[in-house]
């Protein structure tokens, strides 16, 4: 191509050195943050994902900066401010960490972010086969529909010994959200 260092082929402050190879008349030694045969490409230093916990990477040229999500801090957003240290859950609730956030796992009868709200334990529908739930001071009580028995109305009362239970609704799994 005939281009030499005299033509100033290196951009962005790259240092031009005459090539030892006859096929390459020059080589550009690029400064930090640039790459390419002529130092024409800016290196995407954020592609290395230096920011933890979902932080946003900003390449300021002279340096990288991480803009942290709420609840995180540090040069790389590595410090979780929302862990359970110093976090109080009321009414016997326990703090559960996970995914950079925390939440309270509340004791029976309480709900809300800090377990300060009185919850209706019957809202979770703990009685089977149409049994009616009542919150009692000593715990929940199910009043079973005719034909069922057990603390949670789980057993059919079948004098004829029939074996079938109503089928579970399709797709419901233990641990799935309530419907």
């Amino acid at each position: 191509s005939g281009v030499t260092c005299a033509d100033g082929p290196c951009f962005n402050g790259g240092l031009c050195v005459g090539g030892a190879d006859p096929d390459s008349a020059y080589i550009c030694h690029c400064p930090p943050g640039f790459q390419g045969s002529n130092c024409e490409k800016r290196v995407d230093r954020c592609s290395l994902q230096p920011c933890r916990n979902g932080g946003l990477c900003l390449d300021l040229g002279h340096a990288l900066r991480c803009r942290c999500r709420a609840g995180f801090a540090g040069p790389r957003c590595e410090h979780d401010l929302d862990d359970c240290a110093g976090r109080a859950c009321a009414n016997g609730g326990t703090c559960v960490e996970g995914g950079g956030a925390h939440r309270c796992s509340c004791a029976l009868g309480f709900g809300g972010r800090d377990c300060r709200e009185r919850a209706d334990p019957c809202a979770a529908r703990p009685c089977a086969h149409g049994g009616r739930c009542y919150a009692h001071f000593s715990g929940l009580v199910c009043a079973c529909a005719p034909g069922y028995m057990g603390a949670r109305c789980e057993f059919p009362v079948h004098p004829d010994g029939a074996s079938a239970l109503p089928a579970a609704p399709p797709g419901l799994r233990p641990g799935d959200p309530q419907r």
Epitope: S105, L108, P121, V141, L172, G175
Partner: antibody, heavy 124, light 113 residues
Framework: QEQLVESGGGLVQPGGSLKLSCKVS????????VSWVRQAPGKGLEWIGY????????YYASWVNGRFTISSHNAQNTLYLQLNSLTAADTATYFC?????????????????WGPGTLVTVSS | DVVMTQTPASVEAAVGGTVTINCQAS??????LSWYQQKPGQPPKLLIY???TLASGVPSRFKGSGSGTQFTLTISDLECADAATYYC???????????????FGGGTEVVVK
Amino acid sequence: QEQLVESGGGLVQPGGSLKLSCKVSGFDFSNYGVSWVRQAPGKGLEWIGYIDPAFGRTYYASWVNGRFTISSHNAQNTLYLQLNSLTAADTATYFCVRVALVVAGVAYYGMDVWGPGTLVTVSS
Amino acid sequence: DVVMTQTPASVEAAVGGTVTINCQASQNIYSYLSWYQQKPGQPPKLLIYRTSTLASGVPSRFKGSGSGTQFTLTISDLECADAATYYCQSYYYSSGSSYGAFAFGGGTEVVVK
């Protein structure tokens, strides 16, 4: 996430006692109970009993005969298994297990989350 | 108490094959039958509950069937990872003491060739 972690296992002499703990987190006792299950080395699973904290009820296998007691404490986030009058036959890994009882009005009674277990060795 | 009789105690099959495990309850347990898989050094893992419903993340190669006192677990298209011990578990009403109780079968070892 839902988790159960047992502790308190170890070596105990015949006739002795031991109290196992189970720290639970991440689920609502309205729908779930907690069972204790044991497994002797190289043997099968044996159900001990379970507690339904929302209903304040505890149930045991008939072979337990009052030697073991299940209880809950501290707003039902820790459960216990008290082992008394232990013999070599009680040597086993003891598992604390979440039981899906009645979820959204549908009865399941499957043991869906297991702790890693704690080993109890009864030997002189 | 209900006694759960699981057969066979051990079964061997080739990769890609099918295995059937039976579980018989000594009294009617309706559809309260679960199946578990256990590998050495690990706690059991729930596969199927209420006779035929797959637990979350369990492949459809596992199939449960039955009712009353006779139940079956069928594993098709066997994979090496299926080598484990399988247990059935019942929930039943103990009329003598008017409460619910659980019971496990003796286990079936599945060997995959």
